[in-house]
């Protein structure tokens, strides 16, 4: 009874197409597959950034796989051939592992790379990234930003830099068509006559860094002798109403402070007949139904009513 063996895949490699972190893992079928012509061979692929504790595992019949990585670190991957039990009249047979690594060889000490990189997608419309120069770099150092997301043919360079003292310290992006709900890759590299500058890589999804505009058209409506309804409208722009959470701050007679978080554009407040003044502000944020994270908007303009009995009429600024 001869033991069934299978070779590992050939020519296993990680290919960098220049997409700033989106890499191709590819391989060729193992040698001597002739014995298993009637059989669909599968491959188990494991990969991770070096330093990560966990491997991502994929089982596929294909000869390639694509995923995003952090190019600030190296990447390691391994793959072996799987013969399903149907092919071997028994248990599954696995080859030995084929292994490969990939990294972008760094230039420059880490302190030279950009510091405090911050990207905000304003109102789900305008992306702006800003950074501080690396520590100890001279004024001749300049940084350049490149970006890519699925849908672009190749990585693009920023064309509208924000500058301070002649140095690029930020980028205003153009309209980014069909760019949300997918990984957005950025590389900021640099050059200097004085010393090599370390590149930095960043990956995020645009819907998770949205800072909306504040809500507008704040109003009061008396619902009953002891209830007032606060209302507002969603800010102008592309973000649908179902995507908002709101935080309200309410002051009664300059003393009581109420804060609340709500999911729609109204809030009912219990009041007393003695209330002489009522003010509130609202801010908005993209909620968990539309993103995994977000940034609170600025507070709205304050809406107040004072000087008349609040029970007498509808209050509208």
């Amino acid at each position: 009874d001869t033991e069934i063996k299978v070779n590992p895949p050939q020519d296993f490699e990680i290919v960098d197409p220049g997409y700033l972190g989106y890499l191709y893992l590819q391989w060729q079928p193992p040698l001597s597959l002739d014995h298993f012509k009637e059989c669909t061979v599968e491959y188990e692929l494991k990969y991770r950034n070096i330093g990560s504790e966990t491997w991502k595992t994929i089982i596929t019949k294909n000869l390639h796989y694509k995923d995003g990585f952090d190019l600030n670190k190296g990447i390691e991957a391994k793959i072996h051939t799987l013969l399903p039990w149907q092919c071997t009249n028994g248990s599954e047979v696995q080859s030995s592992w084929a292994e490969t690594t990939y990294w972008i060889s760094p230039q420059g000490i880490p302190e030279t790379k950009v510091q405090d990189m911050d990207c905000v997608y304003y109102n789900w419309q305008y992306l702006l990234c800003s950074w501080k120069p690396g520590i100890g770099v001279l004024l001749d150092t300049n940084y350049n930003l490149f970006y890519w997301y699925e849908g672009l043919d190749h990585a693009l360079q920023c064309v509208d830099y924000i500058k301070a003292d002649g140095q690029n310290i930020g980028c205003r992006f153009p309209y980014l068509e069909a760019s949300d709900y997918k990984d957005f890759y950025i590389c900021v590299n640099g050059s200097s006559e004085n010393k090599p500058i370390r590149s930095s890589y960043f990956t995020f999804q645009l819907q998770n860094i949205v800072k909306p505009l504040p809500p507008v058209y704040l109003t009061f409506t008396r619902e009953s002798s002891c209830e007032i309804k606060l209302k507002w409208s969603i800010p102008l722009g592309p973000i649908p109403a179902r995507c908002f959470d709101y935080e309200i701050e309410i002051r009664e007679d300059d003393t009581t402070l109420v804060t609340a978080t709500v999911e729609n554009e109204t809030y009912t407040l219990k009041t007393t007949n003695e209330t002489r003044q009522l003010c509130f502000v609202v801010r908005s944020k993209v909620n968990i139904y539309c993103s995994d994270d977000g940034i609170w908007s600025e507070w709205s303009d304050k809406q107040c009513w004072e000087g008349e009995d609040l029970s007498k009429k509808t209050l509208l600024r």
């Epitope: 990294w103 420059g108 302190e111 100890g136 010393k195 090599p196």
Partner: antibody
Framework: QVQLQESGPGLVKPETSLSITCTVS????????VHWVRLSPGKGLEWLGV???????DYNAAFISRVNISKDNSKNQVFFKMNSLQANDTAVYYC??????????WGQGTTVTVSS | EIVLTQSPSILSASVGEDVTITCTAS???????LHWYQQKPGSAPKLWIY???NLASGVPSRFSGSGSGTSFTLTISSLQAEDAATYYC?????????FGAGTKLEIK
């Protein structure tokens, strides 16, 4: 497997210069940076500088005026030169491979004694 | 420059004991840039722990590393005779790259 081997003169006279060659095997210096570090009884481990895979260099500011690092990619060799040696430059000089913001493999070191 | 102060400078302990070496930085070091090396007499330093807490290939699991900011530690649980060596912490964050003065670990 990865190996780095330093070769130096052993004994050098004060006020002269020191040249050490680091010959590497098992990896290409076009893909990895190479650091130079020394170990002396008085000062412990001191980083002297690095030549990156692209050929650019970074030096310890304390040595920048008298250290030069260069390389020959075709021979997979890195060269370290230090001028104006004094007795307190007596040390074991190491080359080490840069990987993942560490020095993951080191040569065995070459002992340099500065004495007349 | 970032000065790394190791303590103690010499540590004498018995086989089976737990030992801790500390490394204090004069200014904050990002944890991914703080490493430990082991050096035995007549040999080159070996990368031992990288990025504060990751063991280099072949390092026994009785070693561990932790810390953040300016305070980092290397711990050996149940010391073995072959652990006798000098241990150096190292920061790769800012130029010049610097090392601690070393902790010489002796077996009683």
């Amino acid at each position: 497997q990865v190996q780095l081997q330093e070769s130096g003169p052993g004994l050098v006279k004060p006020e002269t210069s020191l040249s050490i060659t680091c010959t590497v095997s098992g990896f290409s210096i076009t893909k990895y940076g190479v650091h130079w570090v020394r170990l002396s009884p008085g000062k412990g481990l001191e980083w002297l500088g690095v030549i990156w895979s692209g050929g650019s260099t970074d030096y310890n500011a304390a040595f920048i005026s008298r250290v030069n690092i260069s390389k020959d990619n075709s021979k997979n060799q890195v060269f370290f030169k230090m001028n104006s040696l004094q007795a307190n430059d007596t040390a074991v000089y190491y080359c080490a491979r840069d990987f993942g913001d560490t020095m993951d493999y080191w040569g065995q070191g070459t002992t340099v004694t500065v004495s007349s | 420059e970032i000065v790394l102060t190791q303590s103690p400078s010499i540590l004498s302990a018995s086989v089976g004991e737990d030992v801790t070496i500390t490394c204090t930085a004069s200014s904050s070091v990002t944890s991914s840039y703080l490493h430990w090396y082991q050096q035995k007499p007549g040999s080159a330093p070996k990368l031992w722990i990288y990025s504060t807490s990751n063991l280099a290939s072949g390092v026994p699991s009785r070693f561990s590393g932790s810390g953040s900011g300016t305070s980092f530690t290397l711990t050996i649980s149940s010391l073995q005779a072959e652990d006798a060596a000098t241990y150096y912490c190292h920061q790769y964050h800012r130029s010049p790259l610097t090392f601690g003065a070393g902790t010489k670990l002796e077996i009683k």
